[in-house]
Every structure is written in C-alpha cells, then in structure tokens.
C-alpha cells in the first residue's frame, strides 16, 4: 500500500486553522457540531434562497516540500434542494474546487484570478429532510489530485455558488512508495511521481549475504503515482552458505551447506562427509571418500569400487570369452566402467609382454560398461593373462587400482575361415584364411571332404597353401568340407563343416 504524507488536515486541526472567507463575514462560516458525542468543526454555507452566490473559502498556505502530485480528499455533506420550501429555485447541489501555487504566503490578500479550477464537486448522496431531522449526516467522500506542482507551496479554495454544503474534512497529502523488502532486495522510500502514465524506476540493493545471480538482472521496482510498487524486475538470491529466512539471508546451520547462490534452502550434509561449520558452502569428504569434479555438492562422497567380483576366461580355439560380475562394493557410485588389458607369455622362454597390438577385442577394451568381452586373434600355444579393472568417477583420485586377472593357454589355432571359390560338375575350388599371427605356426592345412549322407568314407588332401581344388567329384552332389591347420604341436581347431554342391550336367554351360 502507498504511504500517505499529510500536508493539511482540517478535521484534525480542531477548528484552529483560521481559513480565509470571501466576502468576509458572509457565505462560508466555521461552525461546531456534535457527532457521535464528539465536537467536530466544519465550514458550511447555506445561502440557497439568494441567487448569484460567489462565496470563497481559502485554506492557509500549504508548504509543498517534496510533493510532486498532491491528493485532495474532501468529506462533505450537501442538503437536498427539494428539502427547502418551494425547492429554493436558486439552490445548487455542487461546489467548485480550486488551487493556486505560490512561492510565498499572500496572507489575507485573496485574488480569485490566481486560482485554477480543479473540478466541480458533486455529492453521491444528498441529505434529504428526514436525514437532516434525524441528524443522519450523509457524508460524501471525493478525491482529486493535482500535479506536477513546482512552487514552494499552494492554496486550495472552495467556491460556493448557492449550495447548502458543509465541509467536514479536507485532507491534502502526497504519496510515497514505502520502504520495501522484496526478492531479498531493499527499496528505499520513494516519492510517487506526478505523471499518471510514468513509473519511476528505483534500483534495489541486495540485503546482507544476498547477491544478484550470475547473468541475472539487478533488482528494480517501479513506483507508481498512487504510491504502489509495480513491475518488479530482477532479484537477489542468498549467496552460497546462506538461505532465505523471511526477508533475510541466514547462515546455514552446522551440518548443513549451500554451494551456490540460489533459491534453494541449505541442505543437510550428505553421507560420508564431515560435519560442516556454520555458513558452509560445501561439506568435506570423510577420509577415503572423494568427490569427482562433476559431482554436485549435494551428492554423497564416494570411493573407488572393489575389483570385479568374479572373472572367467573361456578359450574357444584362438578366441577367449572373458566374463565377470560387478564389484561387490560400487563405492556408492553408478558410473562404473571396466578396462581389459592383455599380457602374453611364451611357454618356451617364459618371456612376457603386452599383447594389445596383436589381439582383437569384440569392443574397445577401455570404458566398457558391459561385463563381458571376446578376445580373438590369439596365437596358439601361448599363455595369456587378462586383467579386468573396475573404475568409477573417483578412481582417478587414488593411486590404488581395483582389478582381477585370469589366465588362459591357447593350444590350438583359430579355425580357418573357408570360402567356395568356384565349382564345376566334377570339382570344387575352396580357399581359407587364418589370422596372420597364427600362420607362422602352421605346417600344413588338411582338407577333409565327403559326400553328404555317406558317413562311411571320406577323402583327405593336405597342402601348404591357402586353397585347393577337389577333383573327380560326382555331378550335382553335395559335399561336406572341413579345413584344419596342422602345427608342430598337433592339430589346430577345425573349421566348421561347410556344404558345397557340384553343378548338374545341364547347368555346366552356365
């Protein structure tokens, strides 16, 4: 609500103001009456039976001070012209309100020409005979405003033109937007402007321990003509370590924290933190617990995970499938990833070294989220040790590692990959391949083939190369073909059995 600063209050003055009447001794008259058992003063006039009335009542000179626009509140009563005998033909039911600005008090020197009319004042309710007799004062309240005022002071004047009117209260005031705390900003008491459409912009200052948030607007309010604050812009927020309590920022209690300027309250220190002092912006982690750089301060402190719980390495020829289960202790985090590293050892020499360059993983071996991976292109008759390390967001903050290892010996080469290169009615041309690292260990390749459905007889061809043509075959017949590498240490893993069909005599020309 707007704050009113009173410049003139006739009702409160108890008849002591001594306003000027013109003409002197006629028209307006100061009188006392009793209302609600209290004496009240009023200026009244009731020359309704005589025409051409021009009775003036002028206030004392009122110092303007800092007011720009003044508000004039009038409380008055007007008698019904019909309540007089014959309706009092010259009777009126309105009066006029005037003002004049001046830099000095003219005293009893009254000049009508200096006054500017503000408005004609008409009652909402007139006092009829029955009200008058019963002493029911039909009080009207009218308010007008004038501005901008520029001189040191002013007068008000009331012109009677033949009404029966009593002025019970004349209150002149200006409006201020009151001192205000809003949005944790303090706005000073501000004089309301004089122009109705315009709003005075007032900058606010953040209360103690409050700040304008980064990228936020400075707090501003607009003081309207009627003394009301309008259109708040921007705000202040309690800084880190402080929370809003009513219109102030209060330090977080011990055991609580607030890590940034925000609207949120202080939060209780999360798990695995040490008790915080008053006004804390964060809570330190217990020993052995950590916070990753991207972790919010509200998150509990965490630690690195334990090692993967259970690790198996299953060899399949020249491939190994590694499987493991998540760590039993996640460290309180969900961002666990796994890294797989490989080491190979030569049985003859016992020499070992990393093998990342020579093996192939089914997916990149670092930052794995799944709990299995297949490693292929392993060399036969080699010992491999695989290490699976579990890591989370805080693993980088400690030197220790959480891992489990599994070893496996590769006794066979990987099965060759077989392709049909060509065929005729009596022959099949077949080729194969094995990973280059394993080729040096192969002495010869053994190709076994037989007619499909004939389990009693089969044929074997050996070759050092990577292809062979099988001749003397029956036309339009399906053959089962398998290729196996032979090494100094024995047989490698056989390929899968392929079904290849020779051409029929009719289709041989195609």
């Amino acid at each position: 609500q707007g704050k009113e600063v009173v410049l003139l209050d006739f009702a409160a003055a108890g008849g002591e103001l001594g306003w000027l009447t013109h003409p002197y001794g006629k028209g307006w008259d100061l009188m006392q009456n009793i209302m609600n058992d209290m004496p009240i003063y009023m200026y009244s006039v009731c020359n309704v039976m005589s025409g051409d009335q021009d009775n003036w009542l002028r206030t004392n000179w009122v110092y303007r001070g800092e007011a720009e626009r003044i508000f004039i509140e009038l409380k008055f009563t007007v008698r019904d012209c019909n309540s007089f005998p014959g309706g009092a033909s010259s009777c009126k039911e309105t009066f006029n309100l005037y003002y004049a600005e001046s830099d000095l008090d003219y005293g009893t020197n009254f000049q009508k020409r200096l006054f500017t009319k503000i408005d004609t004042i008409a009652p909402d309710e007139i006092t009829v005979s029955s009200d008058f007799e019963a002493r029911h004062v039909k009080l009207n309240v009218e308010e007008r405003s004038v501005g901008p005022l520029t001189r040191k002071g002013f007068y008000l004047a009331f012109q009677d033109i033949g009404a029966c009117v009593a002025l019970l209260s004349v209150r002149v005031y200006y409006k201020k937007c009151p001192e205000l705390l809003q949005g944790l900003a303090h706005f000073p008491e501000t004089i309301a402007g004089s122009d109705a459409p315009s709003l005075a912009t007032v900058a606010g200052t953040c209360v103690d321990h409050a700040v304008v948030p980064p990228g936020g607007e400075e707090p501003r309010m607009h003081c309207a003509v009627d003394g009301e604050w309008l259109v708040p812009i921007g705000q202040c927020l309690c800084q880190a370590g402080y929370e809003k309590v009513e219109d102030a920022c209060q330090a977080c209690s011990p055991g609580f924290f607030k890590f940034e300027a925000s609207e949120s309250p202080c939060l209780e220190c999360p798990e695995h933190t040490l008790p915080s002092p008053e006004g804390a912006t964060s809570c330190e982690c217990e020993e052995g617990f950590f916070r990753a750089p991207q972790d919010p301060a509200s998150m509990p402190c965490t630690r690195p995970p334990s090692a993967p719980h259970y690790l198996t390495a299953v060899g399949m020829g020249a491939k190994v499938e590694l499987r493991w289960t998540p760590p039993q202790d996640s460290g309180g985090r969900e961002d666990i990833v796994y890294s797989v590293t490989c080491e190979q050892c030569w049985p003859e020499s016992g020499e070992c070294g990393p093998c990342e360059a020579s093996v192939r993983y089914s997916e990149p071996p670092h930052g794995l989220t799944r709990t299995s991976v297949t490693v292929s292109d392993l060399e036969p008759h080699m010992n491999y040790t695989f290490t699976v390390e579990a890591r989370n967001g805080v693993s980088g903050l400690v030197t220790s590692r959480s891992f489990r290892t599994a070893s496996v010996s590769i006794n066979q080469t990987e099965p060759p990959k077989v392709r049909l290169e060509g065929r005729s009615t009596t022959s099949l041309s077949v080729s194969w391949s094995i990973p280059p690292p394993q080729q040096s260990r192969v002495w010869k390749y053994e190709v076994t083939y037989r007619k499909k459905g004939d389990s009693n007889s089969y044929n074997v061809r050996r070759t050092e190369g990577f292809s062979v043509t099988l001749d003397d075959l029956a036309p339009d017949t399906t053959y089962l073909v398998q290729v196996q590498a032979l090494t100094q240490e024995g047989q490698g893993a056989g390929s899968k059995v392929h079904e290849f069909q020779t051409l029929s005599p009719e289709g041989s020309g195609n």
Partner: antibody, heavy 128, light 107 residues
C-alpha cells in the same frame, strides 16, 4: 398561515392529571418537529418536551421526566401533552411550538432545535 | 445544563436608536443560538437562528452575531413595534435552555 392553538389547560390539584392538546393548521404538520415550552408567571421560558415529525424520538426536560408524556396524531394534525403527578411548580403558560427543517438554512442540523412557530399558550394552574 | 445569561435584564431606548442585547452561555455552544421576541400576552416569535441567520419575514434591522459563549442581538433603528421582551435560546444540547429575557421599553 401557520396556526397553533393550545387547549386543555385549567386548574388542577397537586398530584392530579391534565391532557393538553395543540391543533395545527396552515402547514404540513407531519413535516414538523413539535415541542412544548412553558413560562411560569414572571419567570423565564423553559423547554418541556419535543417529538419528531413521525412520532419519535421524544425528549423531556429533567423536571418533567417520568410524569409527562408527549405524543402526536398526524392524521388529526394534533399534538398532545399528558401531564400526571402535577406539582405546584408546574403552574405555567404552556406553549406548543414547531420547527420545520426546510426553514433551517444550515447544511448540518444543530444538536437540538429552535422553534420557528408558536401557539398563544394555555394556562395550567396546579393548586389546592 | 447550559446556563444562558442575558444582559441587561431591561433597557430604555427611543425610536431610531441602535440597541444591542447580549447573551452569554456557560459553555461553548458554537453558533447554535436563536433569538425570540415576545410581546405581553402573546407567543414568542423567532427572529434569528444559528446566531446570525435571519428567519424568513424578519426585518433586516435585526441582526445577530457571536460564537462560542458570547452572542449579541442588534436592532439598528428601533421601531415602535420593536418594544418587547427578547429571549436567547441555545440548542447545542437537548436541554434547549433559554435566557430570562431583556425587556426593551420606550424611554
């Protein structure tokens, strides 16, 4: 022309009763506040009682409160004063008086009334 | 009750004289005062109300003034018809008290 004519006065013994009447004419009786004012021989005027235009409110001087009753009959344009438990000090000429707010050229009514029209009076003598 | 004191209690004057009668209230009555004229054997007649307002039909040689506790009735240019007793009455309270009158006699 406004006329007020009192009647009902006379000689009465102390403790006795009397009813005064005031017949009104020449004006709208129901618009007027009416009152009784008395004047003891060689003494000041003394207000006795008043009644509003519609029959209320009524007021009494302390000296007659509880003994006198003012009333009116607007249909008969008549004002009454019932006087009981009369005393010697009630001996006086009793005037009927009227007030019409329409002739009171003031913006706010006074705390009480004055009297614009008066009757010729009727003498009440209380004596044993 | 409010006491009303008139002075003088009687005065002698000649036709054409200016006569002033005063009335004092025992406490402030603002301007709630009326003046009446009464001739022997007749009813009182209203002259002035609200201290200075002339009642309808009353000659303008009668005037009233004052406020608070001091009031006066002035007859400027006394006429033969004006020889009578004059009463003041306050109506600031329900007791509506009268003064005891000032008798204006022919000198």
């Amino acid at each position: 022309e406004v006329q007020l004519l009192e009647s009902g006065g006379g000689l009465v013994q102390p403790g006795g009763s009397l009813r005064l009447s005031c017949a009104a004419s020449g004006f709208t009786f129901s618009h007027y506040m009416m009152a009784w004012v008395r004047q003891a021989p060689g003494k000041c005027l003394e207000w006795v009682s008043r009644i509003g235009p519609s029959g209320g409110p009524t007021h009494y001087a302390d000296s007659v409160k509880g003994r006198f009753t003012i009333s009116r009959d607007n249909s008969k344009n008549t004002l009454y004063l019932q006087m009981n438990s009369l005393r010697a000090e009630d001996t006086a000429v009793y005037y009927c008086a009227g007030y019409d707010s329409g002739y009171d050229y003031v913006a706010v009514a006074g705390p009480a009334e004055y009297f614009q029209h008066w009757g010729q009076g009727t003498l009440v003598t209380v004596s044993s | 009750d409010i006491q009303m004191t008139q002075s003088p209690s009687s005065l002698s004057a000649s036709v054409g004289d200016r006569v002033t009668i005063t009335c004092r209230a025992s406490q402030s009555i603002s301007t709630w005062l009326a003046w009446y004229q009464q001739k022997p054997g007749k009813a009182p007649k209203l002259l002035i109300y609200k201290a200075s307002n002339l009642h309808t039909g009353v000659p303008s040689r009668f005037s009233g003034s004052g406020s608070g506790t001091e009031f006066s009735l002035t007859i400027s240019g006394l006429q033969p018809d004006d020889f009578a007793t004059y009463y003041c009455q306050q109506y600031n309270s329900y007791s509506r008290t009268f003064g005891c009158g000032t008798k204006v006699e022919i000198k």
